[in-house]
Amino acid sequence: VEVQVSEDPVVALVDTDATLRCSFSPEPGFSLAQLNLIWQLTDTKQLVHSFTEGRDQGSAYSNRTALFPDLLVQGNASLRLQRVRVTDEGSYTCFVSIQDFDSAAVSLQVAAPYSKPSMTLEPNKDLRPGNMVTITCSSYQGYPEAEVFWKDGQGVPLTGNVTTSQMANERGLFDVHSVLRVVLGANGTYSCLVRNPVLQQDAHGSVTITGQPLTF
């Protein structure tokens, strides 16, 4: 028996359902009584879900997994993982045994989009050219860690005096805070770009500093 899985990692958004595809080619006359199917975590060998002795043995993994019982006889051994969490990320191995056995691993990459950045300025009044200001760009509840980039109004990247920190909350999602320290010119626009490297999702924030009231 030959087991086939997706070459590419499966990307799943937090709180959505993911399907880890696994298939085999059943011989003519194949019946489910012959099938032993085991899904396990590749690294720890922890059992996730199994189908043995002709029946679904159920989820051994936080009761959030399911097979596709009507499709098993056609060789579809895929696993459904419900309400995906950050902690589900990793490699899963699909073992199929009929007369002989084969296995293959599929990677699950968990992701969550970042919120539109909020911009804060310190100090935020009585600003004059030549003043040193601190601009903070904050974006929330994303996964995995973001990449943060700053640029000025002409689109020139700003890499000096940038400090970016990322903190994971109890769900494993990151809040990112990036601080740019800059000396004000007469007028200036400063933009931050928060990029999710897995979703390839960009979130933009900017602040324009003029002689007039600030605009965000």
Partner: antibody, heavy 118, light 110 residues
């Protein structure tokens, strides 16, 4: 100015190990992702691995997964590549590169040559 | 993780314009606007010429420009000069935060 300097390359037997280092200066190292890219003699560029600014997220090319480990020490502004179970096909110049511009490697080190003899 | 496809060589006379193509799939070039281009002279480290399809870093000549259509990205060098003779590589994000390079193109100034 931004500078990256690699070290640790050399000649190693097939199956052996080597640890490459990349010392960074001129930018806030901990705020940016870093990559290793390699180039076999007379061949093209091949991406090897990337690590996030804090070191919490790491990704690898299939060709090195399970054998190479990328890491960083932000207190020392240094990037590392631990290479185990080396093969002849790992022979290459290894470059470290910074991601201080979106989606690209804007600053590169001078490279360090790793030669794996069989 | 197959390499992106580039022509092995492109040549032009001084002052001419040349274009280098970089063809991938919807899983890399076609799927994201994160294509970058690098110039590499013999024995030297690569140098970033274009990022995010069509953005030029400061210090890179205006003669270099990038574009993308579907699964193919392009680098155009206008007003070709002797110092442009080098190898050029495209690169793209691909699935799950991985990256992939092109096969490389040798540019010859006739």
């Amino acid at each position: 100015q931004v500078q990256l300097v690699e070290s640790g390359g050399g000649l190693v037997q097939s199956g052996g190990s080597l640890r490459l280092s990349c010392a960074a200066s001129g930018f806030t190292f901990s705020s940016y992702a870093m990559s290793w890219v390699r180039q076999a003699p007379g061949k093209g560029l091949e991406w090897v691995s990337v690590i996030s600014g804090s070191g919490g997220s790491r990704y690898y090319a299939d060709s090195v997964k399970g054998r190479f480990t990328i890491s960083r020490d932000n207190s020392k502004n240094t990037l590392y590549l631990q290479m185990n179970s080396l093969r002849a096909e790992d022979t290459a110049v290894y470059y470290c590169a910074s991601h201080t511009i979106p989606g690209a490697w804007d600053v590169w080190g001078q490279g360090t040559l790793v030669t794996v003899s069989s | 993780q197959s390499a992106l496809t580039q022509p092995a060589s492109v040549s032009g006379s001084p002052g001419q314009s040349i274009t280098i193509s970089c063809t991938g799939t919807t899983r890399d070039v076609g799927g994201y606007n994160y294509v970058s281009w690098y110039q590499q002279h013999p024995g030297k480290a690569p140098k970033l010429m274009i990022y995010d399809v069509n953005n030029r870093p400061s210090g890179v000549s205006y003669r270099f420009s990038g574009s993308k259509s579907g699964n193919t990205a392009s680098l155009t060098i206008s007003g070709l000069q002797a110092e442009d003779e080098a190898d050029y590589y495209c690169s793209s994000y691909t699935t799950s935060s991985r990256r992939v390079f092109g096969t490389g193109t040798k540019v010859t100034v006739l």
